[in-house]
């Protein structure tokens, strides 16, 4: 690879912990997405919280290592946890620059493959590490 991996960086207010230390933030100004050069992997991640009416980004950044899923060219999220009733956390990993900016698609809540009501529960802001 000719370049270090660069990902979109975002952490929603109230999220506990930070993945900022997994890369070097680029000085992109105010109107552009924040960007981070990954230090320990060539892999980006994204986490979205899907409720009945909308998907809200929770975190975006660099993974701490390359692992299965990182070879994906695009962000194809899969369900990981239920932080609260009626919402589902979806995460993706991918291995191209800024691939975590957007997801290619999200299955509707409750669709096959989404964890059932017995899935892991977590308080807001505490679910992120489970998803990672």
């Amino acid at each position: 690879p000719p370049n270090r991996r660069t990902c979109v960086f975002f952490e929603a207010p109230g999220v506990r912990g930070s993945t900022k230390t997994l890369g070097e933030l680029l000085d992109t100004g105010t109107e552009l997405p924040r960007a981070i050069r990954c230090l320990y992997s060539r892999c980006c991640f994204g986490i979205w919280n899907l409720t009945q009416d909308r998907a809200q980004v929770e975190m975006q950044g660099c993974r701490d290592s390359d692992e299965p899923g990182c070879e994906s060219l695009h962000c194809d999220p899969s369900p990981r946890a239920h932080p609260s009733p009626g919402s589902t956390l979806f995460t993706c990993s991918c291995g191209t620059d800024f691939c975590n900016a957007n997801y290619s698609h999200l299955p509707p809540p409750g669709s096959p493959g989404t964890p059932g009501s017995q899935g892991p529960q977590a308080a807001p802001g505490e679910s992120i590490w489970m998803a990672l």
Epitope: P1, P2, N3, R4, R5, T6, E24, L26, T28, L32, P33, A35, C38, L39, Y40, S41, R42, D66, T96, D97, F98, A101
Partner: antibody, heavy 113, light 112 residues
Framework: QVQLVQSGAEVVKPGASVKVSCKAS????????VSWVRQAPGQGLEWIGE????????NFNEKFKGRVTMTVDTSTSTAYMELRSLRSDDTAVYYC??????WGQGTLVTVSS | DVVMTQSPLSLPVTLGQPASISCRSS???????????LEWFQQRPGQSPRRLIY???NRFSGVPDRFSGSGSGTDFTLKISRVEAEDVGVYYC?????????FGQGTKLEIK
């Protein structure tokens, strides 16, 4: 095939600005970083910075910060590099390159009063 | 900034003979992701630079196999197994591990 075609030579006065263009073809413009490199007459190569066309994120050599602006027009697959407050030691051939694997032919910028 | 020091700066070679260029960096070029972002470029007289090698030892497409790269950490080498007339020009090493990216000062290869 991948091609990067740059604008023609420029002669500019000290203190003025110059904007060099780089038109890309033969690949998906938004999928690769465009870097800018310069070479003063008889000298080596110097990295100026890079821009990712899909979102406009750029990364600069601190030496040029405040004087250089990199932009893109994705509708025409063209990258631009503007250098301001030009001095005589900015006289150089300026190259654009697609992640350093394919290079433009270079644009000679001469700063002279 | 990371300083890239090449040697020799001038390299007279007989056609058909091997040639070797050394490049030493002031800091390790191995990045935290396990990759080493070290490249070699050739610039023939009057032409734009051309990438020969990336990632220390990977030949770019279309580059003859007489060119090879090796090294790790701070010490790197470009070798030409048998020099041909078309190899005349200036060779640069380049690092993209640290910002700002930096080039070596260049090695001028000429035919004896």
């Amino acid at each position: 095939q991948v091609q990067l075609v740059q604008s023609g030579a420029e002669v500019v006065k000290p203190g003025a600005s110059v904007k060099v263009s780089c038109k890309a073809s033969g690949y998906t413009f938004t999928d690769y970083w465009v870097s800018w490199v310069r070479q003063a007459p008889g000298q080596g190569l110097e990295w100026i910075g890079e821009i990712y066309p899909k979102n406009g994120v750029s990364n600069f050599n601190e030496k040029f910060k405040g004087r250089v602006t990199m932009t893109v027009d994705t509708s025409t697959s063209t990258a631009y590099m503007e250098l301001r407050s030009l001095r005589s030691d900015d006289t150089a051939v300026y190259y654009c390159t697609r992640q350093r694997d394919y290079w433009g032919q270079g644009t000679l910028v001469t700063v002279s009063s | 900034d990371v300083v890239m020091t090449q040697s020799p700066l001038s390299l007279p070679v007989t056609l058909g003979q091997p040639a070797s260029i050394s490049c030493r960096s002031s800091q390790s070029l191995e990045y935290g992701d396990g990759y080493t972002y070290l490249e070699w470029f050739q610039q023939r007289p009057g032409q734009s630079p051309r990438r020969l090698i990336y990632g220390v030892s990977n030949r770019f497409s279309g580059v003859p196999d007489r060119f090879s790269g090796s090294g790790s950490g701070t010490d790197f080498t470009l070798k030409i197994s048998r020099v041909e007339a078309e190899d005349v020009g200036v060779y640069y090493c380049f690092q993209a591990t640290h910002d700002p990216n930096t080039f070596g000062q260049g090695t001028k290869l000429e035919i004896k």
